[in-house]
C-alpha cells in the first residue's frame, strides 16, 4: 500500500483531461496536483469520471481548501457539487448569482436536497436578504420554493422582491404564509391602478384582512370563486351579502356550488336569511327573520 502513494513515472497529470478516467483511485490521489485541479475545475464536468474518482477529486480539494472552497472553484464544481455535504457547503461564501444558477442547474429536475437548501441559505445570508433577482432564480428552479419557507423567513423578504412572484409560486402556501406575504404585496403594488392592482394582488389575497376585502368590493373586481375560497374565513365572515355580491360580480352564482364548504358555509351561517334570499341562489342556513344577532366577539373586546 505504501509504495502506491508515489505517482508512477510518466503519469503526473499536466492538465485535467480525458486520460484521467483510466487512472485508478490511488493514481488520481498521487498524480493530480490539487492546485491544478482547482484552476481547471471547469474541465471536470466534461469528463465521465466515476463516482469513486469524483470522491478522490473532492478529497484533494478538501485538503487544499480546509476552510472552504473559493467561489472561483465553487462556480465550476458541476456534478462534483452532488458529492458535497451540507457541512462542506456551510464553509462556503457564495455571492454570485451565476454561481448559484450553475449549481442549481446540476440538481435540476430533482427535489430540493439538503445540499441545495444549505447552498440557498448561505447565498441568501451572504446577500443579506432574499432580493428580487435571487427569488426570480429560485422560483424558476423550484416553483414551490417560497411556500417551503417558514413564515419567519418570509418576514425578511423585502416588498420589492414580491414583483418576482408568480401566481403558481404561491400554490402550496398556507394561510399563515400568505398572512405574512400579503402586506408586502400590498405595499409593492400600491401604486398600480385598480384593475392592474387586482391582477397582481389576487394570488396573495389569502392573507387579506376584512377591511381590504371590503375596499376591493367597491372596485368592481369580479373575484373568481377559486380566489374567494382561499380567503381567510375570519376575513370573510364580517362581509355583508351586498359586499360579497359586489366582490364576486358575475361569479356570485358560484356560491351555490360551494355552500357546504368553508369559508362560504361559515359565512352563510352569519347572514340574515332575507339578505341571502336577495341573491336568488337558493342559499339556505342563514339567520331566520326576527332573530336578534349578538356579536359576542365585540362584547368581549369592549369588556
Amino acid at each position: 500500500e505504501v509504495e502506491k502513494t508515489a505517482c508512477p513515472s510518466g503519469k503526473k497529470a499536466r492538465e485535467i483531461d480525458e486520460s484521467l478516467i483510466f487512472y485508478k483511485k490511488w493514481e488520481l490521489e498521487a498524480c493530480v496536483d490539487a492546485a491544478l485541479l482547482a484552476t481547471q475545475m471547469d474541465r471536470v464536468n466534461a469528463i465521465p469520471f466515476t463516482y469513486e474518482q469524483l470522491d478522490v477529486l473532492k478529497h484533494k480539494l478538501d485538503e487544499l481548501y480546509p476552510q472552504g472552497y473559493p467561489e472561483s472553484v465553487i462556480q465550476h464544481l458541476g456534478y462534483l457539487f452532488l458529492k458535497m455535504s451540507p457541512e462542506d457547503i456551510r464553509k462556503w461564501n457564495v455571492t454570485s448569482l451565476e454561481t448559484l444558477k450553475a449549481l442549481l442547474e446540476v440538481n435540476k429536475g430533482h427535489e430540493m436536497s439538503p445540499q441545495v437548501a444549505t447552498l440557498i441559505d448561505r447565498f441568501v445570508k451572504g446577500r443579506g436578504q432574499l432580493d428580487k433577482d435571487t427569488l426570480d432564480t429560485l422560483t424558476a428552479f423550484y416553483p414551490g420554493y417560497l411556500c417551503s419557507l417558514s413564515p419567519e423567513e418570509l418576514s425578511s423578504v423585502p416588498p420589492s422582491s414580491i414583483w418576482a412572484v408568480r401566481p403558481q409560486d404561491l400554490d402550496t402556501c398556507d394561510p399563515r404564509q400568505l398572512d405574512v406575504l400579503y402586506p408586502k404585496a400590498r405595499l409593492a403594488f400600491q401604486n398600480m391602478n385598480g384593475s392592474e392592482y387586482f391582477v397582481k394582488i389576487q394570488s396573495f389575497l389569502g392573507g387579506a384582512p376584512t377591511e381590504d376585502l371590503k375596499a376591493l368590493s367597491q372596485q368592481n373586481v369580479s373575484m373568481d370563486l377559486a380566489t374567494f375560497m382561499k380567503l381567510r374565513t375570519d376575513a370573510v365572515l364580517p362581509l355583508t351579502v351586498a359586499e360579497v355580491q359586489k366582490l364576486l360580480g358575475p361569479h356570485v352564482e358560484g356560491l351555490k356550488a360551494e355552500e357546504r364548504h368553508r369559508p362560504v358555509r361559515d359565512w352563510i351561517l352569519r347572514q340574515r336569511q332575507d339578505d341571502l334570499d336577495t341573491l336568488g341562489l337558493g342559499l339556505q342556513g342563514g339567520i331566520p327573520n326576527g332573530y336578534l344577532v349578538l356579536d359576542l366577539s365585540m362584547q368581549e373586546a369592549l369588556s
Epitope: 417551503s148 419567519e152 398556507d174 394561510p175 402586506p183
Partner: antibody, heavy 125, light 107 residues
C-alpha cells in the same frame, strides 16, 4: 387552552445523544412555528432554531448546526429536538415556545406567546 | 448576528417603586423588540411585543418604549409578583437574539 408539554429531565453521558419532545395542544399545529431556546444555569436565553410544521421548514442558529436536529410528528402535534455529541456545555434547560405573529401595516409582528416548562438536560459521566 | 446588551444584570428596588430596565441592540432593529419575564420557578411569559404593545393579560403597570438601538421596559408601581428576571429579544433578523437578562429583586 394553548399548551406546550415538554418531556422530562434527562441525565446523559458525554458523547451520547438525547431527544427532547414538545407536544402542542389547543391550536392548529401546522400554522405556528415551534422554536427551541437554550438556557444554561444562571445564564441568558439562546435561540437554537425553529420548525414550521406547515411546510416542514427548519432554520437553525448557525452555532447549533452540528448540535441540534429538529423533526416533528404531525399526527401527534409533537416537535422533537435531538442533541448530539453531548458535552458539559450542553447541560442546560431547553425550552420550546410557540411563535405567534400578526400583520401590522406593511410589516409583521412576531413574539413567543406560549412557552413550555423547559426540559433540564444534565451531561455527566 | 445582532447583539442585545442589558448592562444592568441585577436591580434592587422597593415595592411601589418605578423601575426601568434598559436594552441596547448592536444595530437598528426598527422596534422589532419584545420583553419577557422569567419567574424564579423558571416559567417564561411574554410581557410586551413590538417595543410598546402590551400582551393580553399583562398588567398595565408594565410599559415599553424605545427606537433605533435603545429600548426600555418600565414597571410603574412595583408589586411583589414582579420579582423575576427580564429579557429583551430582537426579531429584526434571524438568528433571534436575547439580552443577558436583568434580575429584579426587592430591597
Amino acid at each position: 387552552q394553548v399548551q406546550l408539554q415538554q418531556s422530562g429531565a434527562e441525565l446523559v453521558k458525554p458523547g451520547a445523544s438525547v431527544k427532547l419532545s414538545c407536544k402542542a395542544s389547543g391550536y392548529t399545529f401546522t400554522l405556528y412555528s415551534i422554536h427551541w431556546i437554550k438556557q444554561r444555569s444562571g445564564q441568558g436565553l439562546e435561540w437554537i432554531g425553529l420548525f414550521y410544521p406547515g411546510s416542514g421548514s427548519i432554520k437553525y442558529n448557525e452555532k447549533f448546526n452540528d448540535k441540534a436536529t429538529l423533526t416533528a410528528d404531525k399526527s401527534s402535534s409533537t416537535v422533537y429536538m435531538e442533541l448530539s455529541s453531548l458535552t458539559s456545555e450542553d447541560s442546560a434547560v431547553y425550552f420550546c415556545a410557540r411563535h405567534e405573529g400578526h400583520s401590522y401595516g406593511h410589516t409583521y409582528l412576531w413574539f413567543f406567546d406560549v412557552w413550555g416548562a423547559g426540559t433540564t438536560v444534565t451531561v455527566s459521566s | 448576528d445582532i447583539q442585545m446588551t442589558q448592562t444592568t444584570s441585577s436591580l434592587s428596588a422597593s415595592l411601589g417603586d418605578r423601575v426601568t430596565i434598559s436594552c441596547r441592540a448592536s444595530q437598528d432593529i426598527s422596534n422589532y423588540l419584545n420583553w419577557y419575564q422569567q419567574k424564579p420557578d423558571g416559567t417564561v411569559k411574554l410581557l410586551i411585543y413590538y417595543t410598546s404593545r402590551l400582551h393580553s393579560g399583562v398588567p398595565s403597570r408594565f410599559s415599553g418604549s424605545g427606537s433605533g438601538t435603545d429600548y426600555s421596559l418600565t414597571i410603574s408601581n412595583l408589586e411583589p409578583e414582579d420579582i423575576a428576571t427580564y429579557y429583551c429579544q430582537q426579531y429584526s433578523q434571524l438568528p433571534y437574539t436575547f439580552g443577558s437578562g436583568t434580575k429584579l429583586e426587592i430591597r
